[in-house]
């Protein structure tokens, strides 16, 4: 039975040209995480495999950095980065958990970040 829950940064915004941390946290379960996939719509951004480490998709290598933890840092943001992002946690024995984050990249110099996780 799947007892865990995924906490995410929720809806966040950031400035064009800046960077943002996408973060998910799996709680309320003792399930072992085997791999986390980060996807934007249907496009793979990166994976973190518990045994084999991080792998960043080639088209994002220049502006996606692994971490912190199982999170993902997006750099050099453009307005095209606006949209939904998903963290997909593969675990056993529970199965798959999915979290959703909506990122809005703003042209203006004032962009409010989500309250759950923040970039210093």
């Amino acid at each position: 039975m799947m007892t865990g829950t995924i906490e995410t940064t929720g809806n966040i915004s950031a400035e064009k040209g800046g960077s943002i941390i996408l973060q998910c946290h799996l709680s309320s379960t003792t399930a072992q995480v085997t791999q986390v996939n980060w996807e934007q719509q249907d496009q793979l951004l990166a994976i973190c495999n518990a045994d084999l480490g991080w792998h960043i998709s080639p088209s994002f290598k220049d502006r996606v950095a692994p971490g912190p933890g199982l999170g993902l840092t997006l750099q050099s943001l453009t307005v095209n980065d606006t949209g939904e992002y998903f963290c997909i946690y593969h675990t056993y024995p529970d199965g798959t958990y999915t979290g959703r984050i909506f990122l809005e990249v703003l042209e203006s110099s004032v962009a409010e970040h989500g309250a759950r996780f923040q970039i210093p």
Epitope: I47, N49, L52, H55
Partner: antibody, heavy 116, light 106 residues
Framework: QVQLQQSGPELVKPGASVKISCKAS????????MNWVKQGPGKGLEWIGR????????DYNGKLKDKATLTAYKSSSTAYLQLSSLTSEDSAVYFC?????????WGQGTLVTVSA | QIVLSQSPAILSASPGEKVTMTCRAS?????MHWYQQKPGSSPKPWIY???NLASGVPARFSGSGSGTSYSLTISRVEAEDAATYYC?????????FGAGTKLELK
């Protein structure tokens, strides 16, 4: 559900090459390591290598590095194992297997027989 | 590479009997995976990360161990358990398998 469908049996001559396929369905092919495992007749299991279909990154068992070449095509969700300069020692069943904290999904296996 | 030694090579048991098979590693590993294989079929994931039963595996199976010594135990053997069981590690490259323990029923 996750399925790995492998190509059919092959009978090949010594010195020749063979290319076998593994078509994946039921998951996002590009985001998971695909592995190949060899099982000789009446023998145990031996890891050949792995490929990350998202960018073609590969890693091989040093023992079989000159024997095997792994490729993958995202467009068709298919991974390939090519074996070269075949000898009787290469006669075996070859499995593709997805790694997710264990070899969680396996193809049905492809029998390769090397015989003159 | 890490060598995994399984014992016994062949295990003969009667239905209802408790059996244990072991897997020893030539160096310490974080955890061990186990697979069941029947003739003419591909291996099936059986136990993940030392002690987690794969989906559909009966509760009579259990796994334990740490460091260089791991084991798979069947509390009461049934006819359908007749198969070869392989241990496997990927704590260091390359991943390796044991030679297998063949469980036969009397």
């Amino acid at each position: 559900q996750v399925q790995l469908q492998q190509s059919g049996p092959e009978l090949v001559k010594p010195g020749a090459s063979v290319k076998i396929s593994c078509k994946a369905s039921g998951y996002g092919f590009s985001g998971y390591w695909m592995n190949w495992v060899k099982q000789g007749p009446g023998k145990g299991l031996e890891w050949i290598g792995r490929i990350f279909p998202g960018d073609g990154d590969t890693d091989y068992n040093g023992k079989l590095k000159d024997k095997a070449t792994l490729t993958a095509y995202k467009s068709s969700s298919t991974a390939y194992l090519q074996l070269s300069s075949l000898t009787s020692e290469d006669s075996a069943v070859y499995f593709c297997a997805r790694w997710l904290g264990g070899f969680t999904s396996w193809g049905q296996g492809t029998l390769v027989t090397v015989s003159a | 590479q890490i060598v995994l030694s399984q014992s016994p090579a062949i295990l003969s048991a009667s239905p209802g009997e408790k059996v244990t098979m072991t897997c020893r590693a030539s160096a310490s590993v974080s955890y061990m995976h186990w697979y069941q294989q029947k003739p003419g079929s591909s291996p099936k994931p059986w136990i993940y990360a030392t002690s987690n039963l794969a989906s559909g595996v009966p509760a009579r199976f259990s796994g334990s161990g740490s460091g260089t010594s791991y084991s798979l135990t069947i509390s009461r053997v049934e006819a359908e358990d007749a198969a070869t069981y392989y241990c496997q590690q990927w704590s260091s490259d390359p991943p390796t398998f044991g030679a297998g323990t063949k469980l036969e029923l009397k």
